[in-house]
């Protein structure tokens, strides 16, 4: 049966406390990504920034998860839901930052 | 192997210019998105710029906005970055990324020194 969005959305935080708890080498080696609007369509603008990076085991579970809440198909190099490209960030910076909205989220108990 | 090399570093004064240049090989140069990151003494790294594959999107860090031009020529697999009126601030390594690659695979950098 289909994960309820409530748990789906707590597996994910709880991914990217894992990934910033772990984290001793810089993640993804310092690789930089394009940075968000986190206000609209959080799930398909992170997973199409973040996307882009290959060879990254540490963010691979995220990217499928990210990928199972946004409704569209997401491929690498599709900017659809970025809107604006104005900043890059490490990739490190990136999982913080989506971690503090995640959670925000979740305690208002917008889950999808 | 992707292999980056970056020249066209020094020591410049406050007001002046810079044309930093990186040679790309071991990839396919015209179909990546590139980038210049930068890294001042004892602080972390900043994106400076990115050119899409096809020269149609360029995009600048607010710091740099106006002062620096990114460019390509994808027939001499290289990417340059002009830089004009930079200010003690932009004192920096410089390094050249095939974007969304981690830094073992950029290059050595170009040390940039702005002084008087």
């Known amino acids: 049966s289909p994960v309820p969005p409530s748990t789906a959305l707590k597996e994910l935080i709880e991914e990217l406390v894992n990934i910033t708890q772990n984290q001793k080498a810089p993640l993804c080696n310092g690789s930089m990504v394009w940075s968000i609007n986190l206000t609209a369509g959080v799930y398909c603008a992170a997973l199409e920034s973040l996307i882009n990076v290959s060879g990254c085991s540490a963010i691979e579970k995220t990217q499928r998860m990210l990928n199972g809440f946004c409704p569209h198909k997401v491929s690498a190099g599709q900017f659809s839901s970025l809107r604006v490209r104005d900043t890059k960030i490490e990739v490190a910076q990136f999982v913080k930052d989506l971690l503090v909205h995640l959670k925000k989220l979740f305690r208002e108990g917008q889950f999808n | 192997e992707v292999q980056l090399l970056e020249s066209g570093g020094g020591l410049v004064q406050p007001g002046g210019s810079l044309r930093l240049s990186c040679v790309a090989s071991g990839f396919t140069f015209d179909v990546a998105e590139m980038d210049w990151v930068r890294q001042a003494p004892g602080k972390g790294l900043e994106w400076v710029s990115t050119?899409?594959?096809?020269?149609?999107?360029?995009y600048y860090a607010d710091s740099v906005k106006g002062r620096f031009t990114i460019s390509r020529d994808n027939s001499k697999n290289t990417l340059y970055l002009q830089m004009n009126s930079l200010r003690a601030e932009d004192t920096a390594v410089y390094y050249c990324?095939?974007?969304?690659?981690?830094?073992?695979?950029w290059g050595p950098g170009t040390l940039v020194t702005v002084s008087s």
């Open positions: 050119i899409s594959p096809s020269r149609r999107g360029t």
């Open positions: 990324a095939k974007a969304y690659t981690g830094r073992s695979l």
